[in-house]
Interface confidence: low
């Protein structure tokens, strides 16, 4: 039988009446155009909805937008368009919501062609009031908030000027011209690239990387011959043109660009690219594109300095620069990532790592599933997950994989069971242990979301026909109840719940269509009465993450430590609540060779945990350029994996001697560094 339909599924008592009392409809007085929705702050219940409608005239497009505000998680909305003087808001800039709980919102308005600059509407009270401000420039990008101070904003203008505001957009100052890309770093630092000659495109590979730590009073050139740059975790990366040819190399800095080291990664040619797939304060996953239009490359994982890299995964699917990759961080369990590889026969297969890229394997076949037509052996196959690439290929996949840090172990995704991803209609699968085991959760494609830190999962069938039914589960997707939320079906466009999965409210968005008009409509359902009591100690059970062999004392050890969690029992129907904090208990493991990556000049042969010297470097002194000094490395081939906390056990010795000799890459020599003041 289909999941959730067997006899042992207990029904939630009187749920229809409870949900009916907590279902709130709001019909928007709008012609259907586009709608965008933003949450303002955390746990505030404030939602802003911007609807825009374009009327195409023969020569130009006339636009109209409306702004609505809710302060009860979407149950009721108020039209606040008059607060922004009924101005048409540019949807391509979206609504710029301030970091944390600052309550700040910036809307960018459409202005007539001849105006001197753009116009913004600013609010610092969770959109209760707005102030109109005319800008001395036309913005090219959305306003970017400093992560450290929400009063500091930066924006690029259509004329490539870098503009900064120190008073939340009230007053603006152009701090630099000829800027291609600008990003906030830590401590209110701004990094940006500039061109000297023609334009950003013409100077690609000859750009300079600059830094200002005082919002434009003074500047320091920290890189030349730059192609592009990126920030990830505590690392600053720059791809830099080589002297002799058109290849580029990655350089990395961990001190905001004061000193640089060349990353031990392959160089790339004109048609290739680098991409930071994921980064934290410990390490980085880097994709390096293969030469030619292959659609794949190699994933490398870094050491703690971002300099020494280990090959993690070959034939990693990643189509062209800025294209699609299925690389997904499973946020519900430490160390877990999922992605796709392009196999020799051009089929796409899903791979998973449980140890931050150390080893990749196929996903285990779900117990309750048959192998499909892609499988050579009907008894042996794997689960393959649909993610960004499938969505870009217009397969019948409405959503990417979903996981939430506070819903420990839960991963939900569309997939197919076979030897490779299938183009057939997918089903929805769930894992409750961070990707080790999977179960078919729902037949056919669905939209899904997690509420109350995993206490409730909500799903809506993906259909071209109007819908009026929502499904929900209180036991991590084992059993499902269906609820008819309206008599009149709507054309469904999306599910919205507050980011962070702590809420118990879900909003169903769609439109109604009659003979003459169509209107936006939302239904907000509050599940608080389904989970009628607060969870108590007895509702939780101890769960050891990454457990594969309970008989082994080191069971669950990943990156040198194991973690036990208190998790809600599947049979408990109760509220984790908005203040729920994941309870976990770490314990340190003994070190083994698995806790070390191979150092510079060493590699791991396949299926071997020992690091051996690279043949071409055998007998040579290992000397390399680090922070602008030549270093001599004495090593037996191992370096602890970033973030690994193991103690005792094996302990390979490693020593780096400073040769006190200056060395530079072609990238940036200390003499070239210069500082300027405005």
């Amino acid at each position: 039988s289909a999941p959730g339909e067997d006899e042992e599924c207990g029904r939630v008592r009187d749920f229809v009446a409870k949900l009916a009392n907590n279902t709130h409809q709001h019909v928007f007085d709008d012609l259907r155009g586009s709608v965008s929705l933003s949450w303002v702050g955390d746990s505030t219940g404030v939602i802003l909805v911007l609807t825009t409608f374009h009327v195409p005239l023969v020569i130009m497009t006339f636009g109209q937008s409306k702004l609505y505000r809710s302060e009860d998680y979407g149950k009721n909305f108020k039209d606040i368009t008059d607060l922004i003087n009924n101005t048409f808001i540019r949807t391509e800039f979206g609504m710029a919501i301030g970091p944390e709980n600052s309550g700040k919102v910036v809307l960018t308005a459409e202005v007539s062609g001849g105006s001197r600059g753009g116009r913004i509407f600013r609010s610092s009270d969770f959109a209760k009031n707005f102030v109109q401000t005319d800008l001395p420039f036309h913005p090219l990008t959305q306003m970017m908030y400093s992560p450290q101070n929400s009063d500091y904003l930066l924006a690029l203008s259509t004329e490539n000027g870098l503009w900064v505001s120190k008073n939340f957009g009230g007053k603006w100052e152009e701090i630099h011209k000829a800027v291609c890309l600008a990003k906030w770093g830590s401590d209110n630092t701004i990094f940006f690239t500039t061109y000297a000659n023609g334009s950003c495109k013409a100077d690609l590979g000859a750009l300079e990387l600059w830094r200002t730590s005082d919002l434009g009073k003074s500047f320091k050139t920290i890189g030349v011959k730059i192609y592009s740059f990126g920030l990830g975790g505590r690392f600053l990366f720059a791809s830099v043109m080589a002297d002799k040819d058109t290849t580029r190399r990655i350089h990395v800095s961990t001190d905001q660009g004061d000193t640089w080291s060349m990353a031990q990664l392959p160089s790339v040619g004109q048609e290739q690219f680098y991409s930071i797939l994921a980064a934290n304060d410990d390490m980085v996953f880097m994709h390096v594109d293969e030469p030619g239009d292959t659609g794949f490359g190699t994933i490398f994982t870094s050491d703690d300095r971002g300099i020494v890299y280990s090959k993690s995964l070959d034939r990693h699917l990643y189509t062209t620069t800025g294209g699609e990759t299925d690389f997904t961080n499973v946020t519900s369990l430490r160390g877990v990532y999922i992605t796709s590889v392009l196999s020799e026969d051009n089929s796409i297969q899903t791979m998973i790592t449980f140890d931050q890229g150390g080893r990749w394997t196929h996903l285990r076949k779900p117990e309750n599933s048959e192998c499909d037509a892609t499988a050579k052996n009907k008894n042996e196959c794997s689960l393959h997950i649909h993610a960004s690439y499938s969505i870009s290929q217009k397969l019948n996949v409405p959503m990417a994989p979903l996981s939430e840090p506070n819903a420990v172990g839960i991963v939900i995704a569309h997939g197919s069971v076979g030897d490779a991803i299938s183009v057939m209609v997918p089903d929805v699968y769930i894992s409750d242990d961070g990707g080790y085991s999977w179960t078919k959760m729902l037949e056919g494609p669905h939209y899904y979301t997690i509420l109350d830190s995993g206490g409730i999962i909500v799903a809506i069938e993906h259909s071209s026909r109007p819908i009026n039914v929502i499904k929900f589960s209180t036991d991590e997707g084992q059993c499902w109840q269906t609820y008819t939320f309206t008599r009149d079906p709507i054309y469904f466009t999306g599910l919205a719940s507050e980011p962070g999965a702590r809420s118990m409210n879900i909003s169903i968005w769609g439109f109604t269509e009659s003979f003459l008009t169509s209107q936006w409509v939302s239904y907000t359902i509050d599940f608080k009465d389904i989970l009628e009591r607060n969870c108590e100690e007895k509702d939780y059970t101890i769960w050891l993450a990454h457990s594969t062999d309970p008989e082994d004392y080191e069971d669950g050890c990943i990156l040198g430590y194991k973690e036990q969690f208190l998790r809600l029992r599947k049979s408990s129907v109760c509220q984790n609540g908005r203040d729920y904090v994941v309870t976990k208990q770490p314990s340190i493991c003994l070190c083994s060779l698995e806790d070390f990556l191979c150092d510079f000049g060493y590699y791991r042969p396949e299926n071997d945990s020992k690091c051996v010297e690279q043949p071409e470097l055998k007998g040579h002194d290992l000397e390399f350029c680090l922070y602008g000094r030549e270093e001599h490395l004495t090593t037996n081939g191992y370096r602890k994996i970033p973030g690994d906390k193991c103690q005792g056990g094996v302990n390979p010795v490693r020593e780096v001697k400073d040769l006190k000799k200056k060395c530079t890459s072609n990238f940036l020599s200390p003499e070239k560094q210069n500082s300027k003041s405005n």
Epitope: Y553, E554, I588, G649, V650
Partner: antibody, heavy 124, light 107 residues
């Protein structure tokens, strides 16, 4: 019942090696750490290191690194501790002890079952 | 290495007395502390694990408390068979280290 039985007393000359055995019974030998602790006459307890029989993974105290080797033979549920280049201050009672397994939350490496001890005397 | 300091190093008490032994770690060890009892010529015996959990088979007059750096072993009513040496042991960070011991003697 769970017990650890150690080999008999040894008298060794300085510079020699000694190998003490510890036979386990009454539980799944492979799944529990086996720790080694020694006690010099009139002194306190000193941790030397341990081995996890399931994978043979070892952990040694820095003080004994290079001189101690811990091994196991899972087929006969026996752990061994060999100490080389013996000195007179290695004279002690050597104990093997089973690492306590946590029931739920990790509870630290306690030692819940001990061998009777093996007296090693190093004297010229 | 983490140093474990026990105090007192010895004490005299009578049957029925309440006895308290303290153990201090040179850095925080969370609650990863165990207490052992050792009688002359015998192997140590685990009394308390994880700072406050009583090992099965150990009389309830033994109790442990503390976390971080300061820990206590309490014998609520000393019995004749309790005269022995008591050791604390941390297992938070490798290497495992023991306290110097507290000898409980008959007054």
């Amino acid at each position: 019942q769970v017990q650890l039985v150690q080999s008999g007393a040894e008298v060794k000359k300085p510079g020699a090696s000694v190998k003490v055995s510890c036979k386990a019974s009454g539980y799944t030998f492979a799944s529990y750490y086996m720790w080694w602790v020694r006690q010099a006459p009139g002194q306190g307890l000193e941790w030397m290191g341990g081995i996890l029989p399931s994978g043979g993974r070892t952990s040694y105290a820095q003080k004994f690194q290079g001189r101690v080797t811990m091994t196991r033979d899972t087929s006969i549920s026996t752990a061994y501790m060999e100490l080389s280049r013996l000195r007179s201050d290695d004279t002690a009672v050597y104990y093997c002890a089973r690492g306590k397994r946590s029931s739920g939350w990790y509870e630290g490496y306690g030692m819940d079952v001990w061998g009777q001890g093996t007296t090693v005397t190093v004297s010229s | 290495d983490i140093q474990m300091t026990q105090s007192p190093s010895s004490l005299s008490a009578s049957v029925g007395d309440r006895v308290t032994i303290t153990c201090r770690a040179s850095q925080s060890i969370s609650s990863y502390l165990n207490w052992y009892q050792q009688k002359p010529g015998k192997a140590p015996k685990l009394l308390i694990y994880a700072a406050s959990s009583l090992q099965s088979g150990v009389p309830s007059r033994f109790s442990g408390s503390g976390s971080g750096t300061d820990f206590t072993l309490t014998i609520s009513s000393l019995q004749p068979e309790d005269f022995a040496t008591y050791y604390c042991q941390q297992s938070d960070v490798s290497p495992i280290t023991f306290g110097g011991g507290t000898k409980v003697e008959i007054k």
